[in-house]
């Protein structure tokens, strides 16, 4: 039975040209995390494999940095980066947990972080 929950940075906003950290945290389970995938829509941005470390998709190498921790840093943001991001935790023996983050990239300098929220 899957008992874990994923806490994410929730709905967030950032300025065009700036950077943002996408963070998820898996709690309430003793399952072993084998890999975390970061996806935007259906595109894979990065993989953090427990054994092998980080893989950044070649098309995002210039603008995506691994970490901190299992999180992901997006740099040189553009308005096109607005949208949904997913952290997908592959765990043993529970299976897969998915967290969702919505990022809005703003033209102005009034970007504010949204509240944290949980996805069971």
């Amino acid at each position: 039975m899957m008992t874990g929950t994923i806490e994410t940075t929730g709905n967030i906003s950032a300025e065009k040209g700036g950077s943002i950290i996408l963070q998820c945290h898996l709690s309430s389970t003793t399952a072993q995390v084998t890999q975390v995938n970061w996806e935007q829509q259906d595109q894979l941005l990065a993989i953090c494999n427990a054994d092998l470390g980080w893989h950044i998709s070649p098309s995002f190498k210039d603008r995506v940095a691994p970490g901190p921790g299992l999180g992901l840093t997006l740099q040189s943001l553009t308005v096109n980066d607005t949208g949904e991001y997913f952290c997908i935790y592959h765990t043993y023996p529970d299976g897969t947990y998915t967290g969702r983050i919505f990022l809005e990239v703003l033209e102005s300098s009034v970007a504010e972080h949204g509240a944290r929220f949980q996805i069971p």
């Epitope: 890999q35 996806e39 259906d42 595109q43 894979l44 494999n49 054994d51 092998l52 893989h55």
Partner: antibody, heavy 122, light 107 residues
Amino acid sequence: QVQLVQSGAEVKKPGASVKVSCKASGYTFLSYYMNWVRQAPGQGLEWMGIIDPSGGRTSYAQKFQGRVTMTRDTSTSTVYMELSSLRSEDTAVYYCARARYPSSWPYGTDVWGQGTTVTVSS
Amino acid sequence: DIQMTQSPSSLSASVGDRVTITCRASQSINSYLNWYQQKPGKAPKLLIYAASSLQSGVPSRFSGSGSGTDFTLTISSLQPEDFATYYCQQSLLTPFTFGGGTKVEIK
């Protein structure tokens, strides 16, 4: 040219260990992950594990956990795969295979060794 | 572990035929799917990586498509040297499992 040359055929008794080598040449050894894949007679391909020659990090298929050890010698650009507690079902051709993309793993394996036949028989 | 199911397990075709081999993953693997060709007594050869990218030196009659869980390898016009066994492999999540193979034989 890019090449992987493996050690010669081995005949082992059940319970013994075997260590297969794979010497790389023609590219930057530290930049490419190395996979090990085996193929039993008349059967399909079976992924065993992978090693990062740069840091020595490894990931093994659960099936081989505790029996397989992958190592590397950076001075000779050689990776090794040791399989212990051999049984007859381990009779197979063992291949080393280089990851296609530098410093990463998800894009297949573009260069393969010639294969090493390991026969386990009493 | 992710299970990879190939179909058919074997097929008979003639030179010039269009051949399609399918591979299904037990869960989404995005586009992290590779195709290999193997001839008897030889090491496998990479044909397609990342579901649809043609490996350097591979003839353009080979093509790959699909994403998520369903993938296809197509040989547009089968040549005599294409009679071999073909394997799919997912490389998203360790262990990087292979499909059972599809043997393409001469009709």
